[in-house]
């Protein structure tokens, strides 16, 4: 068994998945609390199956071919909090099978063949918080009379056959407050008026319902924080009309998702009943534009318009959403043009995500981002080339995070496009094809903490003594992986005294570059996948003063020429990450052997 179950945390957490086991191995300690036991073979479970493991708090029995759960199966498991029975073809659950775990909070009965809620022995589940019943054959949500709904927070019925919901059905859930109720994929065809007006919901999900009129009519007088009415590509559903959305006037909703639907008509009054709405997700709703002067969206704080068909940013008619703080337009189907001042009316905007849009701009981004003076997060990653002038982001002086990853940048040297960003903390420049010889590139970033330069190459593969990093003395995290580096000057990082995380992986560095880290202490240092073979004794103190080091995937020498390092390695195993992949390359007889297993005797 020692070769089989994996110990994740001594005496506490074990993974015994997919081992063909038909009982609990004797060598599993009694103190086990967290057990992953899925994909084994337990056709019948009873009061002796797990009786030894009285400390269990989490038990995953997914797809163990369980048919029968007998009386008092979990009688001694008072601490059991999560029980996962997903994917077991249950024929019988004894009335007392769940009597022991008084603190059971999360019960998963997904894909267990249940067709009637009477099947579940519920009377002891006073503390149940979430019940997952997806992918079964349930047609009525009528629970037994004694169903304890008081603490219930999540009730998931997705992908069942619930076509009608009555007031009577919902009465058993009246005690639940802030319940998240999921009917996704049920093709609900009718809701009795008033069924949902007896309690306040955290979220209601009717995703994939072909006829939304049924939902809007049935939810009159209801209150929910979030209403998910999205659909899916393969569902043939009715277009949303303005008239249909009038149903929202009779309910209280803060967050609404309509993804993948089509609108038959969008006019200035389409969203007039959305006056209380704070979040609206219109992902993939085939929109080409939104009309100006739309009523009802004054309080909207978050808007998602991803995967649509806009030609230009002005077509979203941003003036409709004066209170907006978060705007996401990702993966537009067409090449998206930023236009001039298209978002200028969004003076409260804090987060703007324009990634994956094929955006191209020769003079970015002052005119395009005009008046976004409160913007804190800007994502322009995965776009086409952007030309950045000096102070390209001067309209966004409050920026704290700027993500330009995988967007080729054309920078007007020798100035810095970032020089007015006095609050910028995170800058992602992964694979931006930067001219790293421009020493002013990062000037004017006094509080930059996290800099990702992955995939940007340095001239001659060298970071010299004078380099673009000297202006960012506040850096704590520096990522220089895959930068084609061959060497780093001993003084290259001398102005970076605050660093706690340095990633130099996937380069071609030799041990000489370790000298550049001599002034740093207690850092996480990733040197994986470089060209390090022998590490001389004089460099070992530099490694010793760091907290975690990764030297995996280097062509390490395991001969007596490297004995000082090999000895140091074994003494410092607690500091080393990736030791399974830290192997010898030389001599040929030891190639592939883990460093920790090497035993050398050197005269």
């Amino acid at each position: 068994w020692d070769q089989m179950c994996i110990e994740k945390e001594a005496n506490k957490t074990y993974n015994c998945e997919n081992l063909g086991l038909s009982e609990i191995p004797d060598t599993l300690p009694n103190t086990t609390e967290f057990l992953e036991f899925s994909f084994n073979f337990l056709p019948t479970i009873h009061n002796r199956t797990f009786s030894r493991l009285m400390n269990l708090t989490f038990l995953d029995l997914t797809r163990c071919q369980i048919n029968w759960i007998h009386e008092d199966t979990f009688q001694s498991h008072h601490q059991l909090s999560t029980l996962v029975l997903t994917g077991n073809p249950l024929i019988f659950m004894a009335e007392t099978s769940l009597n022991g775990p008084k603190s059971l909070k999360h019960l998963f009965l997904i894909q267990t063949g249940i067709s009637n809620l009477e099947f579940i022995p519920v009377h002891n589940l006073e503390n149940l918080e979430s019940l997952y019943l997806g992918s079964n054959h349930i047609s009525s949500i009528k629970f037994p009379k004694d169903f304890p709904a008081r603490n219930l927070k999540v009730l998931d019925f997705q992908n069942n056959a619930i076509h009608y919901i009555s007031r009577e059905d919902m009465r058993s859930l009246e005690q639940a407050i802030n319940l998240s109720l999921n009917f996704n994929g049920n093709n609900v065809k009718g809701i009795e008026l008033g069924a949902f007006d007896s309690t306040i919901f955290q979220s209601l999900n009717f995703g994939g319902t072909p006829n939304l009129s049924v939902i809007f009519n049935g939810l009159q007088n209801s209150t929910t924080q979030s209403l998910w009415l999205g659909t899916f590509e393969d569902i043939d559903d009715e277009d949303i009309s303005s008239a249909m959305l009038k149903g929202l006037c009779e309910m209280s909703v803060e967050s609404l998702n309509l993804q993948e639907h089509r609108f038959s008509d969008i006019s200035s009054t389409t969203f007039q009943c959305f006056t209380q709405l704070q979040e609206l997700d219109l992902t993939a709703t085939h929109l080409k534009g939104l009309p100006s002067g739309m009523k009802g969206l004054n309080l909207l704080k978050k808007l998602v318009l991803s995967v649509n068909h806009f030609d230009q940013l002005c077509q979203i008619s941003a003036a409709n959403f004066p209170s907006l703080t978060h705007l996401y337009i990702r993966g537009n189907v067409k090449k998206l043009h930023l236009g001039v001042g298209c978002l200028e009316k969004l003076g409260n905007l804090q987060t703007l995500d324009l990634s994956h849009n094929d955006i191209e701009a020769s003079d970015c981004c002052s005119l395009q981002l005009k008046n976004l003076s409160h913007l804190q997060t800007l994502n322009l990653s995965h776009n086409e080339p952007l030309g950045l002038q000096s102070q390209a982001f001067k309209e966004c002086p409050q920026l704290e995070l700027l993500d330009l990853a995988f967007t080729r940048l054309h920078i007007n040297a020798p100035q810095s496009p970032f020089q007015n960003l006095h609050f910028l903390q995170v800058l992602n420049l992964t694979y931006c094809f930067l001219d790293t010889s421009n020493q002013h590139l990062l000037a004017g970033l006094p509080v930059l903490r996290h800099l990702n330069l992955k995939g940007n190459h340095f001239q001659d593969g060298t970071i010299t003594k004078t380099n673009l990093l000297q202006t960012v003395g506040s850096l704590e995290v520096l990522i220089l992986s895959s930068c084609g580096l061959l060497s780093i000057d001993q003084q290259a990082f001398h102005s970076l005294g605050k660093m706690s995380h340095v990633d130099l992986s996937h380069n071609s560095l030799t041990c000489d570059s370790i000298d550049s880290l001599s002034h740093l202490k207690g850092i996480y240092l990733n040197l994986a996948a470089n060209s390090i073979n022998i590490i001389s004794p004089r460099l070992l103190p530099i490694l010793s003063q760091q907290s975690t080091i990764n030297l995996s995937h280097n062509p390490l020498d395991c001969t007596c020429s490297n004995i000082h390092f090999l000895t140091w390695y074994k003494e410092n195993l607690h500091k080393l990450e990736g030791s399974e992949e830290t192997t010898c390359a030389n001599p040929p007889s030891l190639r592939g052997v883990k460093l920790s297993d090497v035993k050398l005797s050197c005269g």
Epitope: Q312, H337, G339, G341, A361, S362, D363
Partner: antibody, heavy 118, light 107 residues
Framework: EVQLQQSGPELVKPGASMKISCKAS????????MNWVKQSHGKTLEWIGL????????SYNQKFKDKATLTVDKSSSTAYMELLSLTSEDSAIYYC???????????WGQGTTLTVSS | DIQMTQSPASLSASVGETVTITCRAS??????LAWYQQKQGKSPQLLVY???TLAEGVPSRFSVSGSGTQFSLRINSLQPEDFGTYYC?????????FGGGTKLEIK
């Protein structure tokens, strides 16, 4: 067919102001920014500034910041440039020109000749 | 401001000849360059954008090269309708500026 039709030639006295118009047709007027370009006699072209007809946002060449004022009338798909405090230096042909992504000019008006003379 | 310098300022050539006009930017402008042709008494017309792409309807005898600071426009087998003045223009930052123009005349 995209067309930019400019107003006719003007003769004005020094110190006066005048307004040139540019009527757009054949495309969505609010979907493209409108630029103005000056060509002095026998000289090169100079970019004056631009306006986004959708929202009225403008950007000027610093050199013309106090000389030109750009406006639009969406209802008639017309862009205007008003030139202030005219001197003989302002005598030139003025063009309106459309661009889509704040870059190059794909369609030009026929030009308006302005002569400033007492 | 970025200065654009064109050369030559003027040249004479015969129908059927090949000519080359060059444009130099005072700073690196990558491929953010357009070329225009202007005939006497007419407005300019877009010939080339993004330094390399011929505008719609421009004949293939026009070819372009260059990026960074040095660009050229070459016209093979000159036709009578090719005579006029040619301008380059950058769109890398504001203000967008034009070259001084190259006047191409019939010899």
């Amino acid at each position: 067919e995209v067309q930019l039709q400019q107003s006719g030639p003007e003769l004005v006295k020094p110190g006066a102001s005048m307004k040139i118009s540019c009527k757009a047709s054949g495309y969505s007027f609010t979907g493209y920014t409108m630029n103005w370009v000056k060509q002095s006699h026998g000289k090169t072209l100079e970019w004056i500034g631009l306006i986004n007809p959708y929202n009225g946002v403008t950007s000027y060449n610093q050199k013309f910041k106090d000389k030109a004022t750009l406006t639009v009338d969406k209802s008639s798909s017309t862009a205007y440039m008003e030139l202030l405090s005219l001197t003989s230096e302002d005598s030139a042909i003025y063009y309106c020109a459309r661009d889509y992504n704040y870059d190059y000019f794909d369609y030009w008006g026929q030009g308006t000749t302005l002569t400033v003379s007492s | 401001d970025i200065q654009m310098t064109q050369s030559p300022a003027s040249l004479s050539a015969s129908v059927g000849e090949t000519v080359t006009i060059t444009c130099r930017a005072s700073e690196k402008i990558y491929s953010y360059l357009a070329w225009y042709q202007q005939k006497q008494g007419k407005s300019p017309q877009l010939l080339v954008y993004n330094a390399k792409t011929l505008a719609e309807g421009v004949p293939s005898r026009f070819s372009v090269s260059g990026s960074g600071t040095q660009f050229s426009l070459r016209i093979n087998s000159l036709q009578p309708e090719d005579f006029g003045t040619y301008y380059c223009q950058h769109h890398f930052g504001s203000p967008r500026t034009f070259g001084g123009g190259t006047k191409l005349e019939i010899k």
